[in-house]
Interface confidence: low
């Protein structure tokens, strides 16, 4: 009679994470009598997956009834597969011995590969804001996928980016993999409303890639432009000076008026107007009582934006042409904030 062979017909099996893997194994003979065991791996470190005679194997079920005398099907199902279950599984026949069972013959092995979806890509930008014309780096990370093959693309407002570098780790065999990519993006003044998108495509996603986004509003700082102008005289001894603060982002801004280098008033931008590109405009004005000045006045609008060093714009106010009113010691009329701001 021909000697028993242990046949594992599937060289490899591919299963999606969370599903059930069926590992097939048949024997060609009922002789010798003895149990089977399933192992993952070979050698001293091999892991027992199923033992016909003993133990608790809650994730494993047999395909056929192993208690039947004529059974030669030793296939098993392993439920709720995870990437950690990947490996080569061996069906091993034992011969009933005296006093103990001994290993008789092993199947050739079935390699179980697990398809696992990548995690949602997480995109992160630089820790500090940057101004237009500067290049900033964005990173994208996704983890836990298998097999290793994966495609990652970067987009800015729907336009594909080309300046990026991607690594998939680890380099060798692993139960699951991670991808890390860094893209370089040049900022423009119009990028407040822009988005950077990292797109990951993998066999497990069935053509529906995962996307992670970052808003450039979290990254960009658009510094303001300043313009100081003198308005027509509102009253005989008063001059209205305005400081137009244009095209800035984010909103955090503090303005200080200086008269001949001395602080006259400080205010914080609150109600601002928003431009179509997402930047803001703001205006502050100062009523100067020219009769309080004997000489020309240098008015300076000084703006500190988003914690950056102050920028300023000055305006020389000529007072010689205006009559001087004695007894007035107020150089600037410190009206309420709402009155000072023109929107």
């Amino acid at each position: 009679e021909e000697e028993l062979q242990v046949i594992q017909p599937d060289k490899s099996v591919l299963v999606a994470a969370g599903e059930t893997a069926t590992l097939r194994c048949t024997a060609t003979s009922l002789i010798p009598v003895g149990p089977i065991q399933w192992f993952r791996g070979a050698g001293p470190g091999r892991e027992l997956i199923y033992n016909q005679k003993e133990g608790h194997f809650p994730r494993v079920t047999t395909v056929s009834d192993l208690t039947k005398r004529n059974n030669m099907d030793f296939s098993i199902r392993i439920g709720n597969i995870t990437p950690a279950d990947a490996g080569t599984y061996y069906c091993v026949k034992f011969r009933k011995g005296s006093p103990d069972d001994v290993e008789f013959k092993s199947g050739a092995g079935t390699e179980l590969s697990v398809r696992a979806k990548p995690s949602a890509p997480v995109v992160s930008g630089p820790a500090a804001r940057a101004t237009p014309q500067h290049t900033v780096s964005f990173t994208c990370e996704s983890h836990g996928f298998s097999p290793r093959d994966i495609t990652l693309k970067w987009f800015k407002n729907g336009n594909e980016l080309s300046d990026f570098q991607t690594n998939v780790d680890p380099v060798g065999e692993s139960v699951s993999y991670s991808i890390h990519s860094t893209a370089k993006v040049v900022l423009t003044r119009e990028d407040v409303h822009s988005q950077v998108i990292c797109e990951v495509a993998h066999v497990t996603l069935q053509g529906d890639p995962l996307r992670g986004t970052a808003n450039l509003s979290e990254t960009i700082r658009v510094p303001p432009t300043l313009e100081v102008t003198q308005q027509p005289v509102r009253a005989e001894n008063q001059v209205n000076v305005t400081c137009q603060v244009r095209k800035f982002y984010p909103q955090r801004l503090q303005l200080t008026w200086l008269e001949n280098g001395n602080v006259s008033r400080t205010e914080t931008a609150s109600t601002v107007t928003e431009n179509k590109d997402g930047t803001y405009n703001w205006m502050s004005w100062l009523l100067v009582n020219v009769s309080a000045h004997r000489d020309d006045v240098k008015l300076t609008c000084q703006v500190e934006h988003d914690g950056q060093p102050a920028v300023s714009k000055s305006h020389d106010l000529k007072v010689s042409a205006h009559p001087k009113e004695q007894g007035s010691n107020t150089a600037a009329e410190n009206t309420g904030s709402n009155e000072r701001n023109i929107y």
């Epitope: 470190g45 027992l48 005679k53 809650p58 950690a84 034992f94 011995g97 103990d100 699951s176």
Partner: antibody, heavy 115, light 106 residues
């Protein structure tokens, strides 16, 4: 009812030998995977030996490999751990366990390796 | 070998309080196993295959986790739960235990 009773512990000098026994009852020893696990005086657990059902395989960690031997006498339904070239770091409580994972534990026997 | 790090090493809880302890593996493991040991007694299997309760273990015990991060939770602490808890892995040879978390009753 499954019961495991260890014996054979004691005081041994470094370099000495000792054989621990584990008497099993309530099941047939030969058909189960059995292990020895030790607990150090600092209460750390360390697996030291395993013998699979049918005595097919025996495994040991590097810390005891070549010095410890696990075996069983199925007629007596008893598991053994032969220990030689003992070191002070082998000191501890030795437990006999059944199955993988360790569903059943004995009460343990104490080994002290000291001059 | 895979090193299992348990935290905290010592903790205390009042009766009825929820308790969570963790076991971190130096490399990914397939499943985690948890044992309970009371003073003067042998360890006892509590949870096998990460989340399955061993026979006779109260349902207030639960296990969870994957990869390198696993945890054991007691939904409502009872006085009899004061013990040392050990995690263990069978995924990689040699099979190792964590250093233990000692849980005391307040």
């Amino acid at each position: 009812e499954v019961q495991l009773q260890e014996s054979g512990g004691g005081l041994v000098k470094p370099g000495g030998s000792l054989k621990l026994s584990c008497a099993a009852s309530g099941f047939t020893l030969s058909t189960y995977t059995m292990s020895w696990v030790r607990q150090t005086p600092e209460k750390r657990l360390e697996w030291v030996a395993i013998i699979t059902s049918g005595d097919t395989y025996t495994y040991y960690p590097d810390s005891v490999k070549g010095r410890f031997t696990i075996s069983r006498d199925n007629a007596k339904n008893t598991l053994y751990l032969q220990m030689s070239s003992l070191k002070s770091e082998d000191t501890g409580m030795y437990y006999c366990t059944r199955d993988r994972p360790l569903f059943h534990w004995g009460q343990g026997t104490t080994l002290t390796v000291s001059t | 070998q895979i090193v299992l790090t348990q935290s905290p090493a010592i903790m205390s809880a009042s009766p009825g309080e929820k308790v969570t302890m963790t076991c971190s593996a130096s490399s990914s493991v397939s499943y985690m196993y948890w044992y309970q040991q009371k003073p003067g007694s042998s360890p006892r299997l509590l949870i096998y295959d990460t989340s399955n309760l061993a026979s006779g273990v109260p349902v207030r015990f639960s296990g969870s986790g994957s990869g390198t991060s696993y945890s054991l939770t007691i939904s409502r602490m009872e006085a009899e739960d004061a013990a040392t808890y050990y995690c263990q892995q069978w995924s990689s040879f040699p099979w190792t235990f964590g250093g233990g978390t000692k849980l005391e009753i307040k």
